[in-house]
Structure formats: structure tokens, C-alpha cells
Interface confidence: low
């Protein structure tokens, strides 16, 4: 017999099957060209000294064999004596150590047995009613297939499933979707309705995230506000990485969980954009404003749970960086300007009403004035900061006001609104004898003292009514008492107290008359 032909003789060995667990298996035969065919199989067990024979029986009952030696693959043409247009039965007999092992039989029509390809290219993955739907284009000239999938998780071995029969230009499969673990899927195909035909290779892995992206377990810290009015948000704890099945541990597209940072600037609500979303890797600089920060986890199926933190405002106040002048036309604020064409947001809120919405105003982009100052003015009619109470003022600046992460804090300070001069006048001034030539003057704290940093000092004025001589005594803003010495008995004095701010002289309190009685000696 010629080696290229199927030999119609008895094979050169006894044909009893040993029934051993080892031996040939997984025989598959298919057409590889218009006139060429290939059969291949696996051999389980020691291969030394094994000779393989591919057996073939025609529908007429005649049988032949190809001797392939130690090879487990054979190519032959349609001229090899095997009928390719009619049904044939093929199997492998492997002869070793004086015994024969036989593979399961395959019955097929060789001409119609095309080697099917697995799903190639892009396999689209979507979620459909709590299940996974995969869809792909049918490989060319291979419409009509049976499709299987296998899937595993990081902790489980492969399990098979079926996509069922397919006969369209696109094929699809419904598969199980795990809630909390990633899965690796592979798909394979074979010709529809031909039981003996072989399966294609498995497709490349399709990596599928869990239905629920993991809860982002992260922690933040915020650095102190720098001299530029910005503070860095840093990630103290990275999100835990999703455990992946073996075939998804490379750069596997589709299984990734992306984490995004959603920033919501709570201060300065009149600015253009209050919320910004950015990748977690890009940790931003923030102004000293209050923010809500959310970390949102999402995968190819959409967003999952998020974690939200509140970052309180930086309450550090600047010592008198703000000048406020009150004139007949209105009020003007001055502060050290930032770069040219900067937009400022001036926000104010009565102290003690931090829960309520702050009032704010956005300036047009402005350049520094000749003195290097930026300004903001308002008329008396506007009623802004018109009430006689303490206001917390914060000024933010940005050259790009629509970019949330480019705002910085210029200053944070307090201001007493309305007619501070009058409202700040100390009341309940009282005089008590202290010694033969001195008195103690007490007063109730000025309303200005409720406003941190606003009250610069008290001034106590004492006038000798006889000589009209006046002396003034500065008193620390934390004190509400002073001792006046070197007074003369029997002389009438008047005492007044005023409260001054850095930019405003207060109004004197009502004059209080007193005198030190002359001591009569016995």
C-alpha cells in the first residue's frame, strides 16, 4: 500500500481493544482545502513505541487504514481511497507493547466537514435582564453552528454551557452573570447538525466583570491650605483590586473597574459649575471651600455603589487682608489682587447661620488696580451685609472660573455689617472707686467682639471737666475693664468708651460722670 493512500488490507496487528484508560481520543476530521483533508487526535499515556493507525469504514462496509507512525495528525487528498462525498466512519487504533487501544468512532461526510472557527474579533458583551449576552459576527462561510461556552471565576474550575443552535450572520449567547466576582468566558463552535464534526478551538478569553462593581474602599486626607490658597487632596488608601480569573490577569479589556472622583464645591454657589468628575488617579488641588467628594466605581455594565465624604471648609482666617470702606454711595472691599483677568467669588454668610445658603457674587474678570488691589463694590440699596451683625466673608479666585479644580482661596475673614461704628459702641459703662486716686471702668463687650478679628481695640477717654484735659487709654479687645489712675479728688470727670476696627473708628459711648470724693480726716 502507498503511504498516501488508505490501505484496504488487514492492519499489521491484532485488533483486540485493551480497554485501557489511556489511548487515542478526541478524533476530529475536516476539509482543509477544496481537495485536502486532515484528521488529528490526542493520545493519552506514554508515547514511547506507540504506532497509530487511522481506520476508515465506507458505507459499503469496506474498511482501510492509514499508518501514521508516532504522528497524531494526518493529511490526505480526495484521491486517497476514502469517499469524501458519502458518510464514512473513522477511528484511531494505537498499537503499543503488544496491545491495541481504540478511540471513539466519528461518523461524518468529509466533504461537508469544515473546520469551524471560534468566534473571532470583537465579542460584544451586554447585560440583558440580569443575564450576560454575548454577540459576535459569524465567521465567513460558517453560518449554521452549534455554540458552547465555558466559564470560570477566580475560585472555580471551568463549567460548560450551551448557546444552542445558531444560523445567522451574527451569533449570540445568553450566559450567567455573577453578582460579585469576575468571570472568564470562552466560546467554541461546530457545524450545526453534524454530530461527528469537531469543535473549533476555544475563542480568546472574554473577561466579564461582576454585575455589581465593588464598593470603593478608599480614604482621603486633605493637606493644609498653602500660601497659594489651595490644598491637596490625597488618597490614603487605594481601592482594592478585583480578583481575576487566570485568563484575565493580563491587560484584559472589559473586566476593569474604573474609579472616578466626583467633586462638588459647596461654597460659592453662584459660580458656573459646581460639580466635576475626574479619574481617581488625578488627585486634585482644592480651594479652602467646603466640598462633597464621591468615589464612583463603574464597569462595562455601568456605575456601581459610591462612597461620599464631606471635606469641611478651611476655617483659617487671614489677619486683615481685607479693607472695607463705607461711603455715602455704598461699600467697597479691597484685597490683594491675583493675576490679571482673574474672576473673584465673594461669599458672605451671617455667623451662626452656617447651615443656610451663603450669599455670593461673581465679579467680572478683573486686573489689579495701580495699588495691586482687587475691588468689589455694592450700593446701600442692595442691602448686602446691611444688617448689623457679624458676617463671615470668603473670597475665592480663578483665572478659569468654569474649571472647578482651579479655584483658590484668596482670604477668609469676618466683617461686621451695617453701621458698625454705632452698633459697636460699648454699652453699660460703669465706674467704681478703686483707691484714693483711681477708679475702675467696666463696660459690656461690644457687638464687634462677636466677630473674630474685627475688634482691634477699645479706647477709653477720660476728660477733666475743670481743665478740659483729655486722656485716652487703648485697651486690648479681649478686655472690658480698665483702671484710671492719678485722678484728683473732688474733680468732676467724664468717661467714654469706643470700639475700633482696623478700618473704622467707633462711636463714643454716652458720657459717664464721676468724681472721687474728698477724704475728710478726723
Amino acid at each position: 500500500c502507498r503511504t498516501s493512500e488508505c490501505c484496504f488490507q488487514d492492519p499489521p496487528y491484532s485488533d483486540a481493544d485493551s480497554g485501557s484508560a489511556s489511548g487515542p481520543r478526541d478524533l476530529s476530521c475536516y476539509r482543509i482545502s477544496s481537495a485536502g483533508y486532515e484528521c488529528s487526535w490526542q493520545y493519552e499515556g506514554p508515547t514511547a513505541g506507540v504506532s497509530h493507525f487511522l481506520r476508515c469504514c465506507l458505507s459499503s462496509g469496506r474498511c482501510c487504514y492509514f499508518a501514521t507512525g508516532s504522528a497524531t495528525r494526518l493529511q490526505f487528498s480526495d484521491q486517497a481511497g476514502v469517499s469524501v462525498l458519502h458518510t464514512v466512519t473513522l477511528w484511531v487504533e494505537s498499537w503499543a507493547r503488544n496491545r491495541t487501544e481504540k478511540s471513539p468512532e466519528v461518523t461524518l461526510q468529509l466533504y461537508k466537514s469544515v473546520k469551524y472557527k471560534p468566534p473571532l474579533g470583537d465579542i460584544k458583551v451586554s447585560k440583558l435582564a440580569g443575564q450576560l449576552r454575548m454577540e459576535w459576527e459569524t465567521p465567513d462561510n460558517q453560518v449554521g453552528a452549534e455554540v458552547q461556552f465555558r466559564h470560570r471565576t477566580p475560585s472555580s474550575s471551568w463549567k460548560l454551557g450551551d448557546c444552542g443552535p445558531q444560523d445567522d450572520d451574527t451569533e449570540s449567547c445568553l450566559c450567567p452573570l455573577e453578582m460579585n466576582v469576575a468571570q472568564e468566558f470562552q466560546l467554541r463552535r461546530r457545524r450545526l447538525g453534524s454530530q461527528g464534526s469537531s469543535w473549533s478551538k476555544w475563542s480568546s478569553p472574554v473577561c466579564v466583570p461582576p454585575e455589581n462593581p465593588p464598593q470603593p474602599q478608599v480614604r482621603f486626607s486633605v493637606e493644609q491650605l498653602g500660601r497659594d490658597g489651595r490644598r491637596r487632596l490625597t488618597l490614603k488608601e487605594q481601592p482594592t483590586q478585583l480578583e481575576l480569573p487566570e485568563g484575565c490577569q493580563g491587560p484584559a479589556p472589559g473586566v476593569e473597574v474604573t474609579y472616578q472622583l466626583q467633586l462638588h464645591m459647596l461654597s460659592c454657589p453662584c459660580k458656573a459649575k459646581a460639580t466635576r468628575t475626574l479619574p481617581l488617579e488625578k488627585m486634585p488641588y482644592l480651594s479652602g471651600a467646603a466640598y462633597n467628594v464621591a468615589v464612583i466605581s463603574s464597569n462595562r455594565f455601568g456605575p456601581g455603589p459610591n462612597q461620599t465624604w464631606h471635606i469641611p471648609a478651611d476655617t483659617h482666617t487671614e489677619p486683615v487682608a481685607l479693607n472695607i470702606s463705607v461711603g455715602t454711595n455704598g461699600t467697597t472691599m479691597y484685597w490683594p489682587a491675583r493675576a490679571q483677568s482673574t474672576t473673584y467669588c465673594i461669599e458672605w454668610q451671617p455667623v451662626g447661620q452656617e447651615g443656610s445658603l451663603a450669599t455670593c457674587n461673581l465679579t467680572a474678570p478683573q486686573d489689579p488696580d495701580p495699588a495691586g488691589m482687587a475691588t468689589y463694590s455694592w450700593s446701600r440699596e442692595s442691602g448686602a451685609m446691611g444688617q448689623e451683625k457679624c458676617y463671615h466673608i470668603t473670597i475665592f479666585a480663578s483665572a478659569h472660573p468654569k474649571k472647578l479644580t482651579l479655584w483658590s482661596t484668596v482670604l477668609s475673614t469676618y466683617h461686621f455689617g451695617g453701621n458698625a461704628s454705632a452698633a459697636g459702641t460699648p454699652h453699660h459703662v460703669s465706674v467704681k472707686n478703686h483707691s484714693l486716686d483711681s477708679v475702675s471702668v467696666d463696660w459690656a463687650p461690644s457687638l464687634l467682639s462677636t466677630c473674630p478679628g474685627v475688634l482691634k481695640e477699645y479706647v477709653v477717654r477720660c476728660r477733666d471737666e475743670d481743665s478740659n484735659q483729655v486722656s485716652e487709654h487703648p485697651v486690648q479687645p479681649t478686655e472690658t475693664q480698665v483702671t484710671l489712675s492719678d485722678l484728683r479728688a473732688g474733680v468732676a470727670y467724664t468717661v467714654q468708651v469706643r470700639a475700633d476696627t482696623a478700618w473704622l473708628r467707633g462711636a463714643w459711648s454716652q458720657p459717664q460722670r464721676f468724681s472721687i470724693k474728698v477724704q475728710v480726716s478726723d
Partner: antibody
Framework: QVQLVQSGAEVKKPGASVRVSCKAS????????IHWVRQAPGQGLEWMGI????????SYAQKFQGRVTMTRDTSTTTVYMELSSLRSEDTAVYYC???????????WGQGTMVTVSS | SSELTQDPAVSVALGQTVRITCQGD??????AGWYQQKPGQAPVLVIY???NRPSGIPDRFSGSSSEDTASLTITGAQAEDEADYYC???????????FGGGTKLTVL
């Protein structure tokens, strides 16, 4: 609501054919496979075959090969099962069933009793 | 073609736990489906896949598998659970489907 509604009971003579219909509603007809299962009186369930409503392709159990034909009409979302050369042992309740990804039959028709008697 | 083997009959005391098994070569590769059938009614799917319960199936029904055996467990059996139970799976040799012979469950 998802349901499969089958045609009524049939009485046939040996050698004749029977055609049972199964109308699907409440879901996308072409997205899920339909199977036919039969149950002879007092016996267990026996799988007969499958049809893919999307393209109409079929696959039959070896036992019924050559005698069973499954077809579908997408315009009426109906699947048909025809069994020919009937014999008395084909007397059974015939069910159609929709399968999910796991090839589990999540929705069943109410069953059609086919009696084969001379 | 492979077969699925079930015990023909199993009984359980009311409120106790019972396990119905299904054995076959195909179960080492495929998940089993489990069906409950009461006299004169169509079967109802109770467990499929790894351990999935269709909506409306009480959580006393659960499924598991190991090697070539699938199990249906009813924890705290009720009188209404008395029925025939069938398993099914893909056939490992020709990819058709196969049913087990069924198990008649009696609740005492």
C-alpha cells in the same frame, strides 16, 4: 406575562401524523430556544428536540430522527411539532418548553394529549 | 448517549430536610436543571445553573453539584412539596438533552 399556549388534544390512528402548535407570548420570541418534551402515561419526561426560533434550525433526539419535524412562524410567534408514522407507544402528553442560558426549561406549555389508537 | 440516574422514590418527615440526587457523566461538565411535577400538571423549574431559583420558588429549595452528581435539597419540607422531581442536563456525548428517570417524593 411570559407564556406558551399549546393546541388541544388529538386522537390519531397508527401510521397517521399529528401536528401540535405552541404559541409564545410575553417575551422576544427569537431570543430563546423552544424544546419539545413528551411524557407517556405514568412515565418520565423524554426530550424530543430543539428549534432555534431565530433562524429555524433544529436538532432532534436520535430516537425521533426521521419522524419528527419542528418548524416556527415568527409572524405569529408560534412553534410547531409534527410527528409522523404514529404508533401506540407515541400516546403521551407533548409539552413545548422555553429554555434559558443553562438549557433549563423555565416556561412550559400546558401540554397536549395525543392518543394513538386503532 | 449518557444517562441520568435518580432514586425512584424518597420520603421525608414534614419539616425535615431531604436531598434528591442525580448522577451521570454529563454532570461533570454541565449544570443540572431540576423540575417539580404534580399529578396532571406541567413540570415547573425549581433550580437551574449553579444554584439559581426562578422567581416564585421558595428559598427552601437549593441545588449543588460535585463531580458527576447534582443534588436538590429541600430544607424544611412542606406537604405541598410532595411531587415527582426530575433532573435534566446536556448529554456529554452528543450535546442533546437528557432527563433523569424521576424521583417520587413523599412527605410524611
Amino acid at each position: 406575562q411570559v407564556q406558551l399556549v399549546q393546541s388541544g388534544a388529538e386522537v390519531k390512528k397508527p401510521g397517521a401524523s399529528v401536528r401540535v402548535s405552541c404559541k409564545a407570548s410575553g417575551y422576544t420570541f427569537t431570543s430563546y430556544y423552544i424544546h419539545w418534551v413528551r411524557q407517556a402515561p405514568g412515565q418520565g419526561l423524554e426530550w424530543m428536540g430543539i428549534i432555534n426560533p431565530s433562524g429555524g434550525s433544529t436538532s432532534y433526539a436520535q430516537k425521533f430522527q426521521g419522524r419528527v419535524t419542528m418548524t416556527r412562524d415568527t409572524s405569529t410567534t408560534t412553534v410547531y411539532m409534527e410527528l409522523s408514522s404514529l404508533r401506540s407507544e407515541d400516546t403521551a402528553v407533548y409539552y413545548c418548553a422555553k429554555s434559558n442560558w443553562a438549557y433549563a426549561f423555565d416556561i412550559w406549555g400546558q401540554g397536549t394529549m395525543v392518543t394513538v389508537s386503532s | 448517549s449518557s444517562e441520568l440516574t435518580q432514586d425512584p422514590a424518597v420520603s421525608v418527615a414534614l419539616g425535615q430536610t431531604v436531598r434528591i440526587t442525580c448522577q451521570g457523566d454529563s454532570l461533570s461538565s454541565y449544570y443540572a436543571g431540576w423540575y417539580q411535577q404534580k399529578p396532571g400538571q406541567a413540570p415547573v423549574l425549581v433550580i437551574y445553573g449553579k444554584n439559581n431559583r426562578p422567581s416564585g420558588i421558595p428559598d427552601r429549595f437549593s441545588g449543588s453539584s460535585s463531580e458527576d452528581t447534582a443534588s436538590l435539597t429541600i430544607t424544611g419540607a412542606q406537604a405541598e412539596d410532595e411531587a415527582d422531581y426530575y433532573c435534566n442536563s446536556r448529554d456529554s456525548s452528543d450535546n442533546h438533552l437528557v432527563f433523569g428517570g424521576g424521583t417520587k417524593l413523599t412527605v410524611l
